[in-house]
Amino acid sequence: DYKDDDESRTETQPPVTNLSVSVENLCTVIWTWNPPEGASSNCSLWYFSHFGDKQDKKIAPETRRSIEVPLNERICLQVGSQCSTNESEKPSILVEKCISPPEGDPESAVTELQCIWHNLSYMKCSWLPGRNTSPDTNYTLYYWHRSLEKIHQCENIFREGQYFGCSFDLTKVKDSSFEQHSVQIMVKDNAGKIKPSFNIVPLTSRVKPDPPHIKNLSFHNDDLYVQWENPQNFISRCLFYEVEVNNSQTETHNVFYVQEAKCENPEFERNVENTSCFMVPGVLPDTLNTVRIRVKTNKLCYEDDKLWSNWSQEMSIGKKRNST
């Protein structure tokens, strides 16, 4: 009856059994367990779990829990059973299972491992060698994301100054959920002497568009018309442009933020695919004006991480006045 049911809710359940942990892909850690032995028959089992630092508490009926995490440090999950979804209910004794990162000298692991998704078409990762590493270490970068069936090895290893790096194709797919996922990265050496380093790169962050390409500058009265080609792969609601105009005579430096704009004025070459236009007001036509443009992603599409594209090549219009 109701009273018995109520008693089973307050009664502490036995602990879960056979808690085990495994790694899938590069950074997907999965814990699984079995229901407790001898649980009350009128108990609808729920499992309470949290990570070692009491983070990410979860109460769910599934006998598994996974997390995407760079395996650079030990991570532990504690699991208990209970008869309701009530967080205030005391769960069974918590059982803990931990997973440690791969072995190796921490000083040998690469540092500053970071990746940028260039123009939604390729990802370029870079890192610094660890302190305890031989200078002739041959690095290998492995990567995985949801649209790959298996872990891939990055082939294009390069060196830029102190940094090593590697780039691989990563094209945005039409699947609307593609960018809700992440790329899992691991860097180690061929000889197995250094401790592997891991990183998880959310596809909503670290996006760097290609620079725009200025196609045309023209004057109409005292207005300067600028026409440029947008970077490919982005939808218009996800980008904005910074147009910088420098005037050689007045030494003024004007900056304008611009939404992707249709080329509707007669001064522009119209209906050209993937081009934007902007009118800079009040520009002196009889002086030299130099224009350059860069582009940034919108925070409503991609996380704010201060990554502008490189500047476009400069283009100038007008006459440079003699200093006499």
Partner: antibody
Framework: EVQLVQSGAEVKKPGESLKISCKGS????????IGWVRQMPGKGLEWMGV????????RYSPSFQGQVTISADKSISTAYLQWSSLKASDTAMYYC???????????WGQGTLVTVSS | EIVLTQSPGTLSLSPGERATLSCRAS???????LAWYQQKPGQAPRLLIY???SRATGIPDRFSGSGSGTDFTLTISRLEPEDFAVYYC?????FGQGTKVEIK
């Protein structure tokens, strides 16, 4: 000239539904986001959410997710904010604003005062 | 979630004086996204500054914005009678709580 014109003031009872509107003119309505902002009596501004009329993609502030629905009809350059069941705490001035990709609100409607009282 | 904290809550000044309003973000933000607004009683807000330092169309040059990272400032070089109002900073989905500039 960029203009956003909002529908008139509304007086409603708790539990009633409501849809207020914001009509844009003087610019390409489908190329800019439209944002909605709440201002409760004597209080500050609260960002509710945005819609991109070009493809009706919406983003809500976590505080307003599930509480309101933002929509748009690009054929008549109009954005909407609606409630299925109003509460007394929804009493506020609601502003729509044009929202470029860099996130500032560069043109505002005059505001719609919504009063919910039994 | 980013929190924007404005200070002071109220600034009492006389016309002709300089006003300095502060907006502090709980974590570093891109200056591209920081805006300032003015709101007078019974009116909709009006955009003053976007991109932390660019004046919006029609805004007098006595208004200027500066800052980067977590600290941003709106400066009104010489207060005019029509400048007494509430000022808000904003970064996408977050507004500061406002600073009221009142006549001393």
């Amino acid at each position: 000239e960029v203009q956003l014109v909002q529908s008139g003031a509304e007086v409603k009872k708790p539990g009633e539904s409501l849809k207020i509107s914001c009509k844009g003119s003087g610019y390409s309505f489908t190329s800019y986001w439209i944002g909605w902002v709440r201002q409760m009596p004597g209080k500050g501004l609260e960002w509710m959410g945005v819609i991109y009329p070009g493809d009706s993609y919406t983003r809500y502030s976590p505080s307003f997710q599930g509480q309101v629905t933002i929509s748009a009809d690009k054929s008549i350059s109009t954005a909407y904010l609606q409630w299925s069941s109003l509460k007394a705490s929804d009493t506020a001035m609601y502003y729509c604003a044009r929202f470029p990709n860099w996130g500032s609100m560069d043109a505002w409607g005059q505001g719609t005062l919504v009063t919910v009282s039994s | 979630e980013i929190v924007l904290t404005q200070s002071p809550g109220t600034l009492s000044l006389s016309p002709g004086e300089r006003a300095t309003l502060s907006c502090r973000a709980s974590q570093s933000i891109s200056s591209s996204y920081l805006a300032w607004y003015q709101q007078k009683p019974g009116q909709a807000p009006r955009l003053l500054i976007y991109g932390a330092s660019s004046r919006a169309t029609g805004i007098p040059d006595r208004f200027s914005g500066s800052g980067s990272g977590t600290d941003f400032t709106l400066t009104i070089s010489r207060l005019e009678p029509e400048d007494f109002a509430v000022y808000y900073c904003q970064q996408y989905e977050t507004f500061g709580q406002g600073t009221k500039v009142e006549i001393k």
